[in-house]
């Protein structure tokens, strides 16, 4: 057993542009509060229950009017840790929401008026009995600061809380096939408590705080003989004694689920179907009732006036389960385009995008050259998950907006001297060549290789390339 | 602000058919996926046929071959044509569309949802 404990340090703007308007006016002053919801594991089909962990309700704040022109500071907090209190082994994994709800404090009608202002969600894995965690969530403009541990309980100590400790009887050593517990050299191991009251005689436990009957008896503290109508659905081994099948114990044996809860056998363990009101892995967690804000993510809650009465959520579009703590799939329907991957954020979609796509949707692709000018009159060419220029004479680079070396490449040939012009590059070819890059040899006889000399042009001359 | 309004659903016996259809309308907006989504009682809402954002048709294994999704851009309308249906087709139909908006973000909107039951 223990006790997850959760401070909020911090609520109010994120950085960045955008600053949300603050939840309160003069004309309708507003208070905080949060709500914490804990369930096992690190995905969110480990916990089929809503908050099978537990859930925990902070109280109000401080009433907050906003300052007319002001920006939204961060707001005033309510005192105290939010506690959420577990009876069984801490699961090391868990998933948490955290919801900042706003009280408005005007004239309503029928009294204040609730509305959820953010919610973060995340996963963890956290060792009871560790220090202080720190966290940062956004939610939309908003940002979250917060701490969080899980601590156990006397007599539990360890990570998961499942090893007890008892001071020592004796100075030097612990009893027979108890060891120290460590670091708590001065405690020895105890042996597992079961349920108070649990027959001695005729129940065990494999857990802290459980009662698992014996062949031939039967109820929440093993202390009911069988009787012999259980033989209509034989289990275990023959009873001596009654001389019929008896139940051999099971996981819902004795029926660990409290507060009126049916239980079902799991291949593993057991799971507890609980009545309205109740909640938790064996339906502990009683008399919550409208007033406690029971329904997540704005659902609206129903009945429920009193402890003894049932609430029921109306989840609004998107959300659902008994408590609206479960978001629909909206990434089923695959918004995203040209294989971008979907991501539920809660407070909106989003998209990451393959290489050469961007937009919300991944919907424009970064290969047109729409909007992508080539300096000094290069012309934009499509391929390779990015644009590309073919530049103009003279010009390179990537945009071409760095003047080429035309002569670095030595484009003349045999020997001809190469000399930059500003249309291009000349050649200045050596005796016995002429041609733009000097590639055609003169004949002995004067005669070019080419069918005929350009007017106004004698061989040897240099040959200007445009 | 953009509504999805539902209708054609009912009661029917199973092997029969319904065709239901879903009416986007509002602003300036235009629609990136639309489709249907269904839940039956005491379980998950689950993506029934869909237009994706690269309006290639999807279909829930369950429905492959019975149902058939299809729209009318002009009327910003999506129709499910729903035959040979089953006991386990009994659930709230809602229709579900992400849509841009005039001001440029996107925003997934759902409808209220039309309830078809098959029984004999």
């Known amino acids: 057993a223990g006790v997850f404990e959760l401070q909020i340090h911090s609520f109010g703007p994120g950085p960045g542009p955008g600053a949300p308007r603050s939840p309160c006016s003069a004309r309708l002053p507003c208070r905080l509060f949060f709500r914490v919801c804990l369930k096992p594991g690190l995905s969110e089909e480990a916990a089929e229950s809503p908050c099978a962990l537990g859930a925990a309700l902070s109280a109000r704040g401080p009433v907050y009017t906003e300052q007319p022109g002001a920006p939204a500071p961060d707001l005033p907090l309510p005192d105290g840790l939010l506690q959420v209190p577990f009876r069984d082994a801490w699961p090391g994994t868990f998933s948490f929401i955290i919801e900042t709800w706003r009280e408005e404090l005007g004239d309503q009608i029928g009294g204040p008026a609730w509305s959820l202002l953010a919610r973060v969600a995340g996963r963890r894995r956290l060792a009871a009995g560790g220090p202080w965690a720190r966290d940062i969530q956004r939610a939309g403009a908003w940002e979250l600061r917060f701490s969080y541990r899980a601590r156990c309980e006397p007599p539990a100590v360890g990570t998961a809380c499942t090893r007890l400790c008892r001071p020592r009887s004796a100075p030097s050593r612990c009893g027979p096939g108890l060891r120290p517990c460590a670091p708590l050299e001065d405690e020895c191991e105890a042996p597992l408590v079961c349920r108070a009251g649990c027959s001695p005689e005729h129940g065990f436990c494999e857990q802290p705080g459980e009662c698992r009957c014996l062949e031939g008896w039967t109820g929440p503290l093993c202390t009911v003989p069988v009787s012999t109508s259980s033989c209509l659905s034989p289990r275990g081994p023959s009873s001596a004694t009654t001389g019929c099948l008896v139940p051999g114990p099971g996981p819902c044996d004795g029926n660990p689920c409290a507060n009126g809860g049916s239980c079902s056998e799991t291949p593993r363990s057991f799971e507890c179907t609980c009545p309205r009101g109740f909640y938790g892995l064996r339906c502990e967690v009683s008399g919550v009732t409208c007033a406690d804000g029971p329904c997540f993510n704005g659902g609206l809650c129903v009945g429920g006036a009193d402890p003894d009465s049932a609430y029921i959520c109306h989840c609004p579009p998107g959300f659902q389960g008994s408590n609206c703590e479960k978001r629909v799939d909206r990434c089923s329907l695959q918004p995203c385009r040209n294989g971008g991957l979907c991501l539920d954020l809660g407070h909106a979609l989003r998209c990451r995008c393959r290489a050469g796509f961007a937009g919300p949707r991944c919907e424009h692709d970064l290969d047109d050259c729409a909007g992508r000018a080539c300096a000094n009159g290069g012309t934009c060419v499509e391929g390779g998950g990015a644009h590309r220029c073919s530049c103009a004479l003279g010009f390179g680079g990537r945009d071409c907006r760095e003047r080429a070396d035309p002569c670095a490449a030595r484009p003349c040939a045999h020997g001809g001297r190469c000399y930059a012009h500003f249309s291009g590059l000349v050649c200045a070819c050596a005796p016995g060549y002429m041609g733009a890059r000097c590639e055609f040899p003169v004949h002995p006889d004067g005669a070019s290789a080419l069918p005929a000399a350009p007017p106004g042009l004698r061989p040897g001359d240099p040959q200007r390339y445009l | 602000e953009v509504q999805l309004v539902e209708s054609g659903g009912g009661e029917v016996q199973p092997g029969g058919s319904l065709r239901l259809s879903c009416a986007a309308s509002?602003?300036?907006?235009?629609?990136?996926?639309m489709g249907w989504y269904r839940q039956a009682p005491g379980k998950q809402r689950e993506l029934v046929a869909g237009?994706?954002?690269?309006?290639?048709?999807i279909y829930a294994e369950s429905v492959k071959g019975r149902f058939t999704i299809s729209r009318d851009n002009a009327k910003n309308t999506v129709y499910l044509q729903m035959s040979s249906l089953r006991a386990e087709d009994t659930a709230v139909y809602y229709c579900?569309?992400?849509?841009?908006?005039?001001?440029?973000?996107?925003?997934?909107?759902w409808g209220q949802g039309t309830l078809v039951t098959v029984k004999p």
């Open positions: 509002g602003f300036t907006f235009s629609i990136n996926a």
């Open positions: 579900a569309a992400d849509v841009q908006l005039f001001s440029r973000d996107y925003e997934f909107y």
């Open positions: 237009f994706t954002g690269d309006t290639n048709t």
